[in-house]
Interface confidence: low
Amino acid sequence: KSSNEATNITPKHNMKAFLDELKAENIKKFLYNFTQIPHLAGTEQNFQLAKQIQSQWKEFGLDSVELAHYDVLLSYPNKTHPNYISIINEDGNEIFNTSLFEPPPPGYENVSDIVPPFSAFSPQGMPEGDLVYVNYARTEDFFKLERDMKINCSGKIVIARYGKVFRGNKVKNAQLAGAKGVILYSDPADYFAPGVKSYPDGWNLPGGGVQRGNILNLNGAGDPLTPGYPANEYAYRRGIAEAVGLPSIPVHPIGYYDAQKLLEKMGGSAPPDSSWRGSLKVPYNVGPGFTGNFSTQKVKMHIHSTNEVTRIYNVIGTLRGAVEPDRYVILGGHRDSWVFGGIDPQSGAAVVHEIVRSFGTLKKEGWRPRRTILFASWDAEEFGLLGSTEWAEENSRLLQERGVAYINADSSIEGNYTLRVDCTPLMYSLVHNLTKELKSPDEGFEGKSLYESWTKKSPSPEFSGMPRISKLGSGNDFEVFFQRLGIASGRARYTKNWETNKFSGYPLYHSVYETYELVEKFYDPMFKYHLTVAQVRGGMVFELANSIVLPFDCRDYAVVLRKYADKIYSISMKHPQEMKTYSVSFDSLFSAVKNFTEIASKFSERLQDFDKSNPIVLRMMNDQLMFLERAFIDPLGLPDRPFYRHVIYAPSSHNKYAGESFPGIYDALFDIESKVDPSKAWGEVKRQIYVAAFTVQAAAETLSEVA
């Protein structure tokens, strides 16, 4: 029997029943419950929360809820030897030391086990030397320093402001530039919005607030000691020297009060332009070293953190499908936090909890989804997406054969302005259709759809009358599902107005001040934005699990493939002479995209017309849709990044958070004019065009009539 026959409820009614069951008040209650103490990965507190969630998901009505544990490499500060940075004079005396902890927020003064700010996986070390200010430590910032300003970072300690790109990329860039240490700091230009007070009186970062975070360059590997395989009881572990992605130089984060003390003494070169100046009352001189009277003073880092193999726990809940139990729709978000996790991750975990409760309520009334829904509470996301990656490595054979879709559920909010969605093009129409059915929570849009407010506030930069939907990058738990396994993925959250708020992320990100009160007082007092995000995430899961024909539109992939081909071609065309010299042609790629477009169009026509009452044909058509994302996977992976296997999308090599299209070609073309061997470099461009063209053509053929 189909799930609808079993309950005699129409699909539309089911969706409405599911959405109506979601309550803002419950999300608020769950958020409060999840944020009263820290839940750092690998700690007893986070294990206890895993068991609590397991118990509650069972009560909510899931068929089964299991803990899946792994022993992975984590990183912690040394409790007896705190990390700090000092300014030392010529005698080696410490004349200034940075703070050892953040001043606790009101009401949390007596909470124990607040981990002090640190850069996870920093090696130990006590380097000392002159300081060089490197702006955001992006690739282009080091180009500016080394190529234009002729400043050598070799043997220097660099200080970089947080923002714009993933912190791990900053550290990698500093290492490549020869630096011997990295200081990361939050500049008010990026983490203090004008006209807003600092916490606890507003949502801005106080001077003593510091952003924690890992500084790995894992490129999708998961546990650094067991790349490609689960960190289970019989795992073979690499030695620390062979571990994947660990930084080789000490790194430490500080707040802007401490940064002021380091930056105010800077001498050497003036900043190259205004884009290198933040908002502190300092000259933003690049260095190297301190100015005039202070030129004999140096900076010294004292880093004593340790890397330890530690047990982590995922919670995996199952709601078995009535018709296609061997097809999995996954909703997953992490549970571990740096401290209280008021936004990251618990604003997401609370939403997942309410979605599980709503699905459970329907199940108790006799309903089942058509396909199986898996719910996941991931551990150790903050340490490199470890929980989700290890679970996916352990279950990769099942997932690649049965995985329909993965919906991510980290922070539900990073602002309260409008919706933000990143997803596979296969989900564009699903997201558009769903948001047209949901009410906007925004002021001034009463009675209007979410689609309307979203489109108005965040228009597509390319297409009129459409909202912006971004490419998936990384930095969150969808990575292994999308970039490695090729499972259609998406994420949604409420975000800020990027036009008026130029700061990076939200100001209190990964600080001790990310509390329940931050959300309840300043971001979403009525929890209406949380509810909307629950409706979007939950609605997507519902449709993916319950629609008879999978709600994927392959024609949208055709459109973006053409756009991405145009884009990469225009990048290449900045080198017309070399393209001529080395006979570089994009004809094969454009031809493949054209074929894909035609085949996708014909497939969509067949999808309208086929006999949906024939279960074999229905399954066949759905399998073609499910496996389309899989068809973009290259088993050999991208050059030097074997776990990034998607040929159309990968995290940018310069910023893990950002998605890049045709990444193989893009990376081959990047800075190609500086390559020593142009013939070899352009040969690699040609090879990458070949790989991309083949992959697009092969993917197109999966949509052809099967016989």
Epitope: E499, R555, D556, A558, V559, R562, K563, D566, K594, T597
Partner: antibody, heavy 116, light 107 residues
Framework: EVKLEESGGGLVQPGGSMKLSCVAS????????MNWVRQSPEKGLEWVAE??????????HYAESVKGRVIISRDDSKSSVYLQMNNLRAEDTGIYYC???????WGQGTTLTVSS | NIVMTQFPKSMSISVGERVTLTCKAS??????VSWYQQKPEQSPKMLIY???NRFTGVPDRFTGSGSATDFILTISSVQTEDLVDYYC?????????FGGGTKLEMK
């Protein structure tokens, strides 16, 4: 109310130059990409050029038929967009409209005639 | 360049009639098609964007549909003021291109 007002059209000889202007009001001009579109009985509606906003580095795009002869520019402080046309040809004759991003709002047009 | 072909070039119709205008793209443009109405001595006005979304202030007798290469503008019950020129245009890729237009005339 969104308003776009073009000016600067007129009669010009082949090989001559002309600068068209468009003043915008009723919206935050600096946030929007702007286009010039022309219309003639022979060619119908024809997109000419686009200039993007500061956040897009004022990127410009041109139709092949005008590339190298036309420059689109903008002055956000004056809420104005311009079309400098050089080496004019008879086929450039038509009504020139200034349009807001996606051609969702159009001005009333200014007529350019290229004839000896 | 993507060619947008409109047909018929002109149509004679009576007030109250339902009318369907067609626009065909030479290659897939997704749903990035707009429809414009142009009255004599006036500039074009947007009617439909994103193939099927009615622009602000446009009467609901105007409906757009289609995707990929085939697009339709339907006027459910033609009024006298609707007997003017209609153009489709694509904003999927450069250069942006327009159809040659369809002229609605009184029967």
């Amino acid at each position: 109310e969104v308003k776009l007002e073009e000016s600067g059209g007129g009669l010009v000889q082949p090989g001559g130059s002309m600068k068209l202007s468009c003043v915008a009001s009723g919206f935050t001009f600096s946030n929007y990409w702007m286009n010039w579109v022309r219309q003639s009985p022979e060619k119908g509606l024809e997109w000419v050029a686009e200039i993007r906003s500061q956040s897009n580095n004022f990127a410009t795009h041109y139709a092949e038929s005008v590339k190298g002869r036309v420059i689109i520019s903008r002055d956000d402080s004056k809420s104005s967009v311009y079309l400098q046309m050089n080496n004019l040809r008879a086929e450039d004759t038509g009504i020139y409209y200034c349009t807001r991003r996606w051609n969702n709002f159009w001005g009333q047009g200014t007529t350019l005639t290229v004839s000896s | 360049n993507i060619v947008m072909t409109q047909f018929p070039k002109s149509m004679s119709i009576s007030v109250g009639e339902r009318v369907t205008l067609t626009c065909k793209a030479s290659e897939n443009v997704g749903t990035y098609v707009s429809w414009y109405q142009q009255k004599p001595e006036q500039s074009p006005k947007m009617l439909i964007y994103g193939a099927s979304n009615r622009f602000t202030g446009v009467p609901d007798r105007f409906t757009g549909s289609g995707s990929a290469t085939d697009f339709i503008l339907t006027i459910s019950s033609v009024q006298t003021e609707d007997l003017v020129d209609y153009y489709c245009g694509q904003s999927y890729t450069f250069p942006y291109t327009f159809g040659g237009g369809t002229k609605l005339e009184m029967k």
